[in-house]
């Protein structure tokens, strides 16, 4: 089965459909897929050279 028209850009695409809690909407494939959680670490102490990088938690199967 083919996906929708490939010329359909993100700004034209239908709004993401609600997904179940363990999923999120992937604009690339325009469907709900398994998703992990994003997390932002606590800021480094004052004077630290750079902010802590944003990281992620692995998706749940």
């Amino acid at each position: 089965m083919r996906r929708g028209p490939r010329s359909l850009r993100g700004r034209d695409a239908p709004a993401p459909t609600p997904c179940v809690p363990a999923e999120c909407f992937d604009l690339l494939v325009r469907h709900c897929v398994a998703c992990g959680l994003l997390r932002t670490p606590r800021p480094k102490p004052a004077g630290a050279s750079s902010p802590a990088p944003r990281t992620a938690l692995q998706p749940q199967e």
């Epitope: 999120c24 604009l27 690339l28 897929v33 998706p59």
Partner: antibody, heavy 125, light 107 residues
Framework: EVQLVESGGGLVQPGGSLRLSCAAS????????IHWVRQAPGKGLEWVAW????????DYADSVKGRFTISADTSKNTAYLQMNSLRAEDTAVYYC??????????????????WGQGTLVTVSS | DIQMTQSPSSLSASVGDRVTITCRAS??????VAWYQQKPGKAPKLLIF???YLFSGVPSRFSGSGSGTDFTLTISSLQPEDFATYYC?????????FGQGTKVEIK
């Protein structure tokens, strides 16, 4: 441990066919999209196709549309790339990769986190 | 299709240098950009996704920034193992095209 293993590459004459396989372990392919990416000798990465096994959605690069078919068998946890009408310019290492997604405001933020080792396809007479 | 243009195509740098690679999209891709590192004969490795998120296990000397059409990968202090080719890729819409690559060589 997540692993992707490609197979099926080899030497084929122009106009010929090959079927590549991408066997997944450590995760179920129905939970994400699987992509084929190729790299011609000394060149950069070129995305080829993707499949969303849970629903059968697919898409292709213009350069292979009508000649290549991507598919998946969730019971075997394996994705495939059927390559027909092969041309010399299809000569490349073919990688399969999993797209990982993280939830950012309900939308996927992601990239291709696991890749196979690659399989070489040579199209030559 | 959205085109991704990387610059420079190659650069020479020394261990300890700060290295910046840029990627420009032909259309707005929001923050849907990933960066990969590839060494000869090996599969690419994911470094950064969603423009600025560091992938698990990637050293913190790598960072990404940008949104819309202009994106940057920065290596704050180049290490010997960082000499490789780097690619950007968007995933805002299909097809998810790659940049042409930037080869980081030893000066």
């Amino acid at each position: 441990e997540v692993q992707l293993v490609e197979s099926g590459g080899g030497l084929v004459q122009p106009g010929g066919s090959l079927r590549l396989s991408c066997a997944a372990s450590g995760f179920t392919i129905s939970s994400s999209s699987i992509h084929w990416v190729r790299q011609a000798p000394g060149k950069g990465l070129e995305w080829v196709a993707w499949v969303l096994p849970s629903v059968g959605f697919t898409d292709y690069a213009d350069s292979v549309k009508g000649r290549f078919t991507i598919s998946a068998d969730t019971s075997k946890n394996t994705a495939y790339l059927q390559m027909n009408s092969l041309r010399a310019e299809d000569t490349a290492v073919y990688y399969c990769a999993r797209r990982v997604c993280y939830n950012r405001l309900g939308v996927c933020a992601g990239g291709m986190d696991y890749w196979g080792q690659g399989t070489l396809v040579t199209v030559s007479s | 299709d959205i085109q991704m243009t990387q610059s420079p195509s190659s650069l020479s740098a020394s261990v300890g240098d700060r290295v910046t690679i840029t990627c420009r999209a032909s259309e707005d891709v929001s923050s849907a950009v990933a960066w990969y590192q590839q060494k000869p004969g090996k599969a690419p490795k994911l470094l950064i996704f969603a423009a600025s998120y560091l992938f698990s296990g990637v050293p913190s000397r790598f960072s990404g920034s940008g949104s819309g059409t202009d994106f940057t990968l920065t290596i704050s202090s180049l290490q010997p193992e960082d000499f490789a080719t780097y690619y950007c890729q968007h995933s805002q819409v299909s097809p998810p095209t790659f940049g042409q690559g930037t080869k980081v060589e030893i000066k």
